[in-house]
């Protein structure tokens, strides 16, 4: 008889084990899920008050039709800068018209002045002709004025109201360019 | 957490094409851009093509005219096709995506494959 009753005990133990270990289950869900749940709460205020104030461009972007364009405070080489730009969801500028053109040089001209920008210009190491970044030609009108002595890469960069080219390795600020985003309204 | 899944590396001959693809899998990451950087032994590594959500296009300067890149945003996927494959063009390629982690520790990032290589050689 005692035999059964401590048998019974151990069970109802092993029993309580389990609902405790269960109890534990669930509160450790609960409050993974109350987690997920403020997070996801913060990213849709996020999305939403940001979908608010959709502005074209993002914030310290300069708007100009349907491009944005970002002029950067750090100087890097060619090559960074075409990363410093992917990182933003941007490629290096690629000028498609002297409007374009005059606007870049105006802008630059009233936030910086004389200084040298990269643009996703460069010259291709076989033909020597000039090539956007995606591969396509520039408009004879936009071509670097001044053919560069060196021996290595070559890059266009503008500096004042001109397009002009330099060895890719040196350092200079550099501009990126985005889609603006359609205003839904 | 988010990985990057690479294939379509491989051997190939002067002159042949591979097409490589990289997927990004998980969450808690806003895609930016994706894109692909090489390393061959004993050099540094170069950004081969990248490829923002918007579809602007940048290539290397060695790659510019031969390789291809493309991209798929809704399977957060890109794709780089290789033709006119050289010698030099032998190195481990690595997948890249530039976002913004969107999850409790926001901010940018930039996320890198294991890498394929790529072998062109007769």
């Known amino acids: 008889k005692l035999l059964q009753v401590s048998t019974i005990a151990m069970q109802q133990q092993e029993k309580l084990i389990q609902q405790e270990r269960a109890l534990l289950n669930f509160t450790e869900w609960k409050r993974s899920c109350a987690l997920q749940m403020k997070y996801c709460q913060a990213f849709m205020q996020n999305s939403l008050s940001s979908a608010h104030n959709s502005s074209p461009c993002p914030n310290n972007w300069i708007q100009n039709r349907e491009s944005c364009y970002y002029v950067s405070e750090i100087w890097s080489i060619w090559h960074t800068s075409q990363e410093n730009c992917l990182k933003e969801g941007s490629t290096l500028l690629q000028i498609e018209s002297k409007e374009e053109m005059d606007f870049i040089t105006g802008s630059l001209r009233k936030i910086k002045g004389s200084y040298d920008y990269w643009v996703g210009l460069s010259q291709d190491g076989h033909s020597g002709r000039w090539l956007w970044q995606d591969g396509s030609s520039p408009s004879p009108g936009l071509l670097p004025a001044e053919r560069s002595q060196s021996a290595n890469q070559v890059c266009g960069y503008v500096k004042s109201n001109s397009l002009l080219s330099s060895n890719c390795s040196t350092w200079k600020y550099f501009i990126c360019e985005k889609y603006a985003l359609r205003s839904s309204v | 957490q988010v990985q990057l899944q690479e294939s379509g590396g491989g051997l190939v001959q002067p002159g042949g094409s591979l097409r490589l693809s990289c997927a990004a899998y998980?969450?808690?990451?806003?895609?930016?851009?994706m894109g692909w950087y090489r390393q061959a032994p004993g050099k540094e590594r170069e950004l081969v093509a990248g490829?923002?959500?918007?579809?602007?296009?940048t290539y290397g300067n060695s790659v510019r005219g031969r390789f291809t890149i493309s991209g798929d945003n809704a399977k957060n996927t890109v794709y780089l096709q290789m033709k006119s494959l050289k010698p030099e063009d032998t190195a481990v390629y690595y997948c890249s995506a530039w976002g913004v982690k969107t999850g409790p520790e926001s901010g940018s990032g930039t996320l890198e494959g294991q890498g394929t290589q790529v072998t062109v050689s007769s």
């Open positions: 490829i923002t959500t918007q579809g602007r296009i």
């Open positions: 998980g969450s808690i990451f806003s895609i930016n851009a």
